[in-house]
Interface confidence: low
Amino acid sequence: EEELQVIQPEKSVSVAAGDSATLNCTVSSLIPVGPIQWFRGAGPGRELIYNLKEGHFPRVTAVSDPTKRNNMDFSIRISNITPADAGTYYCVKFRKGSPDVELKSGAGTELSVRAKPSAPVVSGPAVRATAEHTVSFTCESHGFSPRDITLKWFKNGNELSDVQTNVDPAGKSVSYSIRSTARVLLTRRDVHSQVICEVAHVTLQGDPLRGTANLSEAIRVPPFLEVTQQSMRADNQVNVTCQVTKFYPQRLQLTWLENGNVSRTEMASALPENKDGTYNWTSWLLVNVSAHRDDVKLTCQVEHDGQPAVNKSFSVKVSAHPKEQGSNTAAENTGTNERNIY
């Protein structure tokens, strides 16, 4: 009598989540009589998947009619596969007995479930950073299988390389998660920039998933301040202008101080956007020189996006020769400056 063979022709089968998996098994002989059972895993902890003899297995059906005596095909079909179904499946021949006695196991078929990664979610820094600072963006995607996955970062279409990526868990699992951090150096022209996290996986058929984040959420472009004085008018009024340029976001408060006392406070709103996404704002103050006996110290104080205020100051000198003044005098570009204007 020839030895019984239990043949599982496929070492592995890969199925997309939601599809059905067919696990093939044939036997070389119908003797001895006894059932075929399918298990996931081996050893004492194995899980019964299907017993062709009895039981209720709603997701599992026999490919051929197991009740026919001459049937040697004990293949099964598992419907609506999920990542939790991954594992090695064994077709096992039993000899009828009390209890049934295991005679022979097939070599096993490994079922891997191709599960699509979830849409990548990109999160940026909790607080804004200024140009020339490096900020981190994180991208997460979950629930994919197999473990092999490719994640790339792009900034304005250009691939980033300062990236750290981890796929968890390290060992075998029904599904995996990926987490990647990209470090991006901000520049002043990044208000309109975008970072994209692109995830490629075998389940996506060459059409990667993308998650995006706008650098406008992460960047703060501090303003440049310039204070200028126009020519004195015939009515002895001096027009002093504070130009606040190239800032982002728009949240900005400007306060004029005359000799340390608040003269006027304005909030920026509905400003037109520069081509690079930043904003400019100009505020002016009319100072009546003839109404003052002493010098007037003017300060343009700008509070941008909750940051410490930046001041530009200069003194308007009350002069016996008002017509000698320059037509357009500017304060320095940085720091707190005082300029005597005649």
């Epitope: 140009a131 020339e132 900034k155 250009n158 691939e159 980033l160 390389s161 300062d162 470090r183 991006v184 150096l185 520049t187 002043r188 022209r189 081509k275 690079d276």
Partner: antibody, heavy 118, light 107 residues
Amino acid sequence: EVQLVESGGGLVQPGGSLRLSCAASGFTLSSYDMHWVRQAPGKGLEWVSAIGTAGDTYYTGSVKGRFTISRENAKNSLYLQMNSLRAADTAVYYCVRGGVWDDAFDIWGQGTMVTVSS
Amino acid sequence: DIQMTQSPSSLSASVGDRVTITCRASQGINNYAAWFQQKPGKAPKSLIYTASSLHSGVPSKFSGSGSGTDFTLTISSLQPEDFATYYCQQYVSYPYTFGQGTKLEIK
């Protein structure tokens, strides 16, 4: 003083290789986009390659697959590895710094001459 | 690739003249246009960036203007040291491209 000094140029046969170096001083090279620009004898300027602050690299079509731009932060140096050189690659090669705000070229090296001839 | 077309390719002028060189981009480049000056045997020198901003140390007789596709470089009063070749460049997207150059000669 901010300065870029190129080296490594010379005479090489067609099909040969050269590695150009650019030593930066007065600033941290890794904080800037850096470029190579070349100028064939009697001709205009041609942008060749760039490396971004994140290590991203870019090339003009005629050198893709033959030239490799890189930098070594520890040495504050930029490199251009040129393989499979052709006569058309004969030029003065300039190392150029891109500005912080918008990558506008601001600092140029003095250039190094590469001659590809048999 | 974005093409940058400079005109004229050569220009004769006298000391004290005001000259204008134009550059046209094959597609809109916002204001990411730059101008360079090059003298024979020397490396180029950066003059103007973002169409109209002067690099540090560049005299104010040089000015630039334009946005989109059309850009100009103007030298208000030519001095002997200004006779050189001038190049425009777009740096809005890779590959960055230069104009073919304008050679400014003494009349």
